[in-house]
Structure formats: C-alpha cells, structure tokens
C-alpha cells in the first residue's frame, strides 16, 4: 500500500519588531521533530502594523490595542487554532524605545505595559515585551542571516541552496540600518576585540564564535537626518536652510521644536531666532556627503582603529549582508545588484540627487512624498556610513550583499531572537537522524 503522510507536526512562533518608524509582526514555522536542526525555521507571514512606531504612542497609549489588532488577528488566521495556545509571542522594541527611555523611563514603561496588556488578550502564549539592547539587535541579526545562509550547518554540500552561499563555513557579517540606530556585527580575523562592550562569545552547533558588534544609537537614517538638520541650521543665516541632500525645488517647513525633540539632536541644540525654518533642496550629492561626514567624529580613537565617535572597529573581514533600510533604500534606488561597483553607485546617486523634485514626483507617482523626498539623503547616508564610517573601500564594496530576504525569510534580528528564546540553536551539534520515523506510515 502507498505510504500516507501524517498530518504535519509543526510549530509556530510570532515576533513583533517594534522599530522606531513602524512595527512589523513575523510568523515563523518549523517541523516539530527538527527543532534543533539548522535552517528549518522559515517565515510564513509578515504583517506591517499600520501607523508609526510604538514610541509615538506617548500621550495616547490607550490607542495601542487598536493599533495592534489587525496584525494580531492576521496571526490568528494564519496559525491553526489548535496551535494558538502553544505559539509563543515575543515583542522586541529597538532604538525608538531606547531613545524614549533615555527621555523618560516612566513613559517608556507605560508604553510597554500597555503593549503587554494588549498582547496578553490574544490566545497565544505571550512571552513578554521588552526593549532589546543594541548589542542584542546586532547579535540576533547576525544569527538570523547566518542561520538562513546555512553557515551553522556542519554538513558540506555539493549544491548551493542560497544565492550568496560560497559553500564554506565562514560566516557573513551583518549590517543593519534602522530609523534610529545602525548595527555592525562580524567575526574579525584573528583580531583581539579591544573593547569588552563590543565582544560576544557564542557556541553554536559545536563551534565557538568570537563576534564583534556595535550599535550606533542616533545613526539610523531618520535620526541621522535630524542630526544633520540640527547641525546645519546652526550656521544658517536665516530661517531658510539650503540643503544639498534634497532635490532641487523641494521645499518643506520644519518646526524647531520637532528638531530638538529627540535626544539625538541635543548636542546641536541652540536658541534660534525663529520657531520654524524652511528646507530648500539644492540636490548636490558631494555637498550632502560632506555635510553627513560632519556627523562622524573621526578625530579621536583610543584603540588601534575606530569606526567613528571613538568606537572600536576591527579590520573588516569576509562578506557582509546589509539588510533592513540598507536594503530598502538601495532597492528603491535600483542599486542592490552584485554587479554595481561603489563608483557606479556614487555616480547614480549624484544623478539621482540632482534630479528636480517635480521630475522625481512624476517618475515615482505612487510613492509617498515623505519617503520619496528622503531617498537622496538616505542613499548618500548609506554610502557615507559604509565608506567613511565603517571603512569599506571601492574594493571591499563587492563583499557587501544587499539582502531583503533569504529563502523567503526577512533578514533582520527577529528570527535570531526567536531562535534564541525558544532554545532552537543548540550549543552542541545535534546527533544527525537521517529520517524521522514519524514522517511516514
């Protein structure tokens, strides 16, 4: 008689990424009997919560429940009802909430408290909401991409399962760019990590990893823009800021109170003779790049070498996956191809930034103006951060892979976070079982 497959024995997990600009819910699925195998967990759903990041719910936390409803209901639909009670739910908040906590622990705690009460109302196994550290964010992003790339598997394969695979076990570095922070994480080559804060030791699948990581708070793309505006308005002669990071013909009024609201601009704060100023775009990549470089203090380094602001950075080693906003921005600019050199990227950015705003709006009619207006800045910022901040060169640029998804799962910290909290990455290599007896009858 023909073998008949049993009902699939699967498990699910939910992670909410509460970022500075928005919240996303991810649903993961894996075969129950292969929990400790590498590469078996995959993403089955992403739901982007409508609205801003949770840190913006200060003064209206009573609206958080409604805000989360659609995506939590989507999770209810996707995950079979019989699995609801055993499906863990985790919420991790990142730099937007780190900044809020710096301003007021009470307000940050209140937001998280209401998030927890809202998520506890669902039939899942809610495991808590917390602000993860920048170090965790970097580490879990690194775990995610290497897990998905199969780098933790001890089996050598004669075939490649993912586009970036080089069939060796050397891990990829992780470059993550958010709205409020950016993370760099990699295994340096035989290099002592000179600052203990930046050192992580892992034992995964029987192998030891000494990992370097740093999270630069305030250097996500949105906070970097606020920093740049706060820096530049200091030297403006009046309430007009001619800004090379915006397209020619672009105009926008900014409230000074909005500019100084974030802790990221405190170092540039001064009493201005006006309450509003107008950004007038002039669209010049080179000048924009120069202005951005002023955000990176490279004059001081207490180590053998630094990234910027006196933060230790070992020599770059190996390939890097650049994800989150690194990917979204470069994808929009059509610059994610492996074949595009750094020089070509710079040329394309020069042309893009110089395009008149009216022309840009016509060419990208479907894109919200708020986002559209910032791609020139964001693209220039990415180049500045990678080249001058992290010391990539024209030659090492080819080692950066702009990655959105790997094997259908988003690159980001959420998968690594769940794998860790559900103990699905063993320290030792599990005994291999070629085929589980429960698979067929």
């Amino acid at each position: 008689t023909q073998n008949k497959a049993l009902p699939e024995n699967v498990k699910y997990g939910i992670v909410l990424d509460a970022g500075s600009s928005h919240t996303s819910l991810y649903i993961y699925k894996w075969p129950a009997e292969k929990e400790n195998d590498t590469g078996v967990v995959h993403q089955v759903e992403e739901c982007r919560v409508k609205g801003p990041g949770i840190s913006k719910f200060v003064q209206k936390v009573n609206e958080i429940g409604i805000y989360l409803t659609d995506c939590m209901e989507r999770a209810r639909e996707v995950i079979p009802r019989s699995q609801h009670q055993e499906t863990p739910v985790y919420l991790g908040a990142t730099a937007g909430m780190r900044l809020l906590r710096m301003e007021s622990e009470e307000l940050a705690d209140r937001v998280l408290d209401v998030v927890e009460r809202s998520l506890s109302n669902y039939p899942f196994d809610f495991q808590g909401a917390r602000i993860i550290t920048g170090q965790e964010e970097g580490a879990y992003g690194w775990i995610t991409i290497n897990y998905l790339l199969g780098k933790f598997s001890q089996k050598t394969r004669w075939f490649s399962i993912v586009p970036y695979e080089t069939n060796n076990q050397e891990t990829f570095g992780a470059l993550d760019l958010g709205g409020a922070s950016t993370q760099v994480t990699f295994v340096p080559q035989n290099q002592t990590i000179e600052s203990p804060d930046n050192a992580l030791q892992f034992r995964l699948y029987g192998k030891d990893y000494n990992v370097y990581t740093h999270s630069f708070l305030c250097y996500g793309k949105d906070q970097a823009l606020w920093q740049k505006l706060a820096k530049d308005i200091q030297v403006a002669s009046n309430e007009i800021l001619r800004d090379p990071c915006f397209h020619p013909g672009y105009k926008k009024v900014v409230n000074v109170s909005d500019l100084y609201k974030t802790p990221c601009t405190k170092r540039f704060e001064m009493t201005l003779p006006f309450q509003q100023f107008e950004i007038q775009g002039i669209g010049n990549y080179q000048q924009c790049h120069q202005s951005i470089l002023e955000l990176f203090n490279t004059s001081y380094c207490p180590y053998s070498q630094c990234a910027f602001n006196g933060i230790f950075l070992p020599p770059l080693q190996g390939d890097f996956g650049a994800f989150s906003a690194f990917y979204f921005v470069m994808k929009f600019l059509n610059l994610t191809s492996e074949k595009v050199s750094q020089e070509k990227v710079t040329e394309m950015m020069k042309k893009f930034c110089a395009q008149p705003w009216e022309e840009i709006k016509t060419s990208y009619a479907g894109v919200k103006e708020k986002y559209l207006s910032e791609y020139c800045f964001s693209g220039t910022y990415i180049l500045s951060l990678l080249l001058q901040g992290y010391h990539f060169t024209a030659d090492s640029w080819e080692h950066i892979h702009f990655i959105g998804k790997i094997q259908g799962s988003d690159a980001g910290w959420t998968l690594g976070y769940m794998l860790n909290l559900t103990n699905m990455i063993p320290a030792e290599q599990p005994l291999s079982t070629p085929l589980s007896h429960s698979t067929y009858v």
């Epitope: 913006k56 200060v58 003064q59 209206k60 936390v61 009573n62 007021s104 009470e106 307000l107 209140r110 209401v114 009460r117 409230n255 109170s257 909005d258 609201k261």
Partner: antibody, heavy 121, light 107 residues
Framework: QVQLVQSGSELKKPGASVKISCKAS????????MNWVRQAPGQGLEWMGW????????TYADDFKGRFVFSLDTSVSTAYLQISSLKAEDTAVYYC??????????????WGQGTLVTVSS | DIQMTQSPSSLSASVGDRVTITCKAS??????VAWFQQKPGKAPKSLIY???YRYSGVPSRFSGSGSGTDFTLTISSLQPEDFATYYC?????????FGQGTKLEIK
C-alpha cells in the same frame, strides 16, 4: 506643584484673530498632552480637542475644525489656542486642561484659570 | 457623539445632607467617566476619574460609581463649600463630551 497659567482676557472685533496662551509649570511639559475646553456664558463645558506635546499631533472635535488652531512652544512649556475670523458666538471662557494618564486612560486633571474672549463690534 | 444626560439639572439641599447626582451615557463608555466641580467665575476642579476613583486631595465624602451607561456622584454629607455646579464627562470616545451640569444650591 502643577500649575497652568493662562493669558488675560481679550476683547476683539468680529473678523479679528486672537491667540491665547497656557503656560505650564511643575511638571515635564512634553510628558502630558493639553486639552482645550470652551464654556460660553452661562453654558456648560465643550471639549475642543487636544494637542500631543510630545509629537505635535492635533486632535480636534468636529465643531472646532477650521478656525481653531492649537500650537506649542516647548522651549517655554506653553500651549496656544488661536481663533481666527472671530464671531460673536465665540465669546466664551477658554480653558486649557492637562491630559494625564490615570488607570489605563487619559483624563483632565489640572485646569488653567480660563481666558475670557469677548467678541463684540 | 455620546450624549451625557445629567439629572437633576438643579438641586436644593442643606449642609449635612446626602446628595446623589446621576449621569446617563447614550452609549456604553465603560468606566471612562470623570466628575468635575465648578464654582462661579472659577475653573472646573477634577474630583473623580475612572467612574469611582478620587483624585488626591479630594475629600472622602465625594464618591463615584457606575459603569457602562449609568453613573452617579454622591456627596455623603454636604459641606458649605460643596455648593457648586457638577459636570460628568466621558472620555471613552472622541469627541469627549460633558453632561449639561447639575447646579447644587443651598436650601
């Protein structure tokens, strides 16, 4: 202690504009929203809306959309209410009231002393 | 909009009396109801929030109760300083609304 001090009475002609202020002290201004409430002579209280002092977001009751504008100057912990194209029926006392979080929702806990705006030709 | 209907609209009572003012909401507002006291020429003063919780400094003779659509404010033993107008207020749904007021006068 928490205090909301409003600007003094105003006498205006129809069609003119008025801007009244509400200066907060005794707490961190950007940690609490600010409501505005109107009370016409001999009448009850009407909620006009509120301003989020952290994000600048504005929420208006339908009857107060258009000629009524809430604004802020966080550097001096002050909220403002501006009314343009004044009409006789805008004659009222206008109150600011702090929006504070108590038991899972937001209430008006402290009130300014009120500003009387009289519109008369 | 949610209507808040207070009754009575005015009430005469004596010092030492127990007084109850009621407020009926046109829709369920949970316990998101507050009560305010206002004296002539003065700003309202916050007494009760979340239907039954007194603000600090508010005398214990003031108490609130109710949930859903029916709410009451009770003053257990009237004092001379309690003669004023009292307003109920719902903050469950935008636009927030107030009752029309109950004027409490000395008999």
């Amino acid at each position: 202690q928490v205090q909301l001090v409003q600007s003094g009475s105003e006498l205006k002609k129809p069609g003119a504009s008025v801007k009244i202020s509400c200066k907060a002290s005794g707490y961190t201004f950007t940690h609490y929203g600010m409501n505005w409430v109107r009370q016409a002579p001999g009448q009850g209280l009407e909620w006009m809306g509120w301003i989020n002092t952290y994000t600048g977001e504005l929420t208006y009751a339908d009857d107060f959309k258009g000629r009524f504008v809430f604004s802020l100057d966080t550097s001096v912990s002050t909220a403002y209410l501006q009314i343009s194209s004044l009409k006789a029926e805008d004659t009222a006392v206008y109150y600011c009231a702090r929006r504070a979080y108590y038991r899972y929702d937001y209430v008006m806990d402290y009130w300014g002393q009120g500003t009387l705006v009289t519109v008369s030709s | 909009d949610i209507q808040m209907t207070q009754s009575p609209s005015s009430l005469s009572a004596s010092v030492g009396d127990r007084v109850t003012i009621t407020c009926k909401a046109s829709h369920n507002v949970g316990t998101n109801v507050a009560w305010f006291q206002q004296k002539p020429g003065k700003a309202p003063k916050s007494l009760i929030y979340s239907a039954s919780y007194r603000y600090s400094g508010v005398p214990s003779r003031f108490s609130g109760s109710g949930s859903g659509t029916d709410f009451t404010l009770t003053i257990s033993s009237l004092q001379p300083e309690d003669f004023a107008t009292y307003y109920c207020h719902q903050y469950n749904n935008y636009p927030y609304t107030f009752g029309q007021g109950t004027k409490l006068e000395i008999k």
